[in-house]
Interface confidence: medium
Amino acid sequence: HSDGIFTDSYSRYRKQMAVKKYLAAVLGKRYKQRVKNK
């Protein structure tokens, strides 16, 4: 879920989450699994 990164503005938070999701897809891993394994 979308609780991995905090910034002082919601839109910037969302942007970082979008990047994180994209990277997870590129790496061939599911986003949730990647966060869970941290």
């Epitope: 979308s2 969302r14 942007k15 979008a18």
Partner: antibody, heavy 121, light 111 residues
Framework: EVQLVESGGGLVKPGGSLRLSCAAS????????MSWVRQAPGKGLEWVAT????????WYPDSVKGRFTISRDNAKNSLYLQMNSLRAEDTAVYYC??????????????WGQGTTVTVSS | DIVMTQSPDSLAVSLGERATINCKAS??????????MTWYQQKPGQPPKLLIY???NLDSGVPDRFSGSGSGTDFTLTISSLQAEDVAVYYC?????????FGGGTKVEIK
């Protein structure tokens, strides 16, 4: 089918408290950030609060900060808005709304029918 | 706070004609190449309905007579051929900066 059903509205005196609930169904609730938006009678829309999918982070406008608290219970697929120190200007229809996916920050794609809060002595 | 100013306040258009609604932000709502601008439609007694997100992206199920354009501070919602079911109030919303803010709304009616 995505459904959002608000409840808990009513008549309350100035300075009083109220807790709104929103029951969600038809989607993976914990995967979505959620918001409350209100609409005073005959007026436009005003954003009230947002909470992330896991409930870790919340955002509020200054008009309600310190008085309102947004929370969620993902096990119950429910969203809440605790409203304290209510004022006449808080009178409005309160909508529960779901935020869209990661790349569409701030857009709300599903809305409940709303619950009415009236603050009056 | 970013102030969203919609114009006109109300608009009467003949069936089949074009309706254009403008929304001007007091400062840019762009961030990293994206415009954090959303348009909603609200019919009487109903909750708002998402029409367009990220300034120009049509939400699923929204008729393609609706379109959005713009960036920075100036945005436009266009209904290319007004239908009777399009009678409603239309709101713009920015979410680039907290607090998220809405325009005052534009009421669209049939002439």
């Amino acid at each position: 089918e995505v459904q959002l059903v608000e409840s808990g509205g009513g008549l309350v005196k100035p300075g009083g408290s109220l807790r709104l609930s929103c029951a969600a169904s038809g989607f993976a609730f914990n995967n979505y950030d959620m918001s409350w938006v209100r609409q005073a009678p005959g007026k436009g829309l005003e954003w009230v609060a947002t909470i992330t999918g896991g409930g870790s982070y919340t955002w509020y406008p200054d008009s309600v900060k310190g008085r309102f608290t947004i929370s969620r219970d993902n096990a119950k697929n429910s969203l809440y808005l605790q409203m304290n120190s209510l004022r006449a200007e808080d009178t409005a229809v309160y909508y529960c709304a779901r935020l869209t996916g990661y790349d569409q920050a701030g857009a709300m794609d599903y809305w409940g029918q709303g619950t009415t809060v009236t603050v009056s002595s | 706070d970013i102030v969203m100013t919609q114009s006109p306040d109300s608009l009467a258009v003949s069936l089949g004609e074009r309706a254009t609604i403008n929304c001007k932000a007091s400062q840019s709502v762009d961030y990293d190449g994206d415009s954090y601008m959303t348009w909603y439609q609200q019919k009487p007694g109903q909750p708002p309905k998402l029409l367009i997100y990220a300034a120009s992206n049509l939400d699923s199920g929204v008729p393609d007579r609706f379109s959005g354009s713009g960036s920075g501070t100036d945005f436009t919602l266009t209904i290319s051929s007004l239908q009777a079911e399009d009678v409603a109030v239309y709101y713009c919303q920015q979410s680039n900066e907290d607090p998220w803010t809405f325009g005052g709304g534009t009421k669209v009616e049939i002439k």
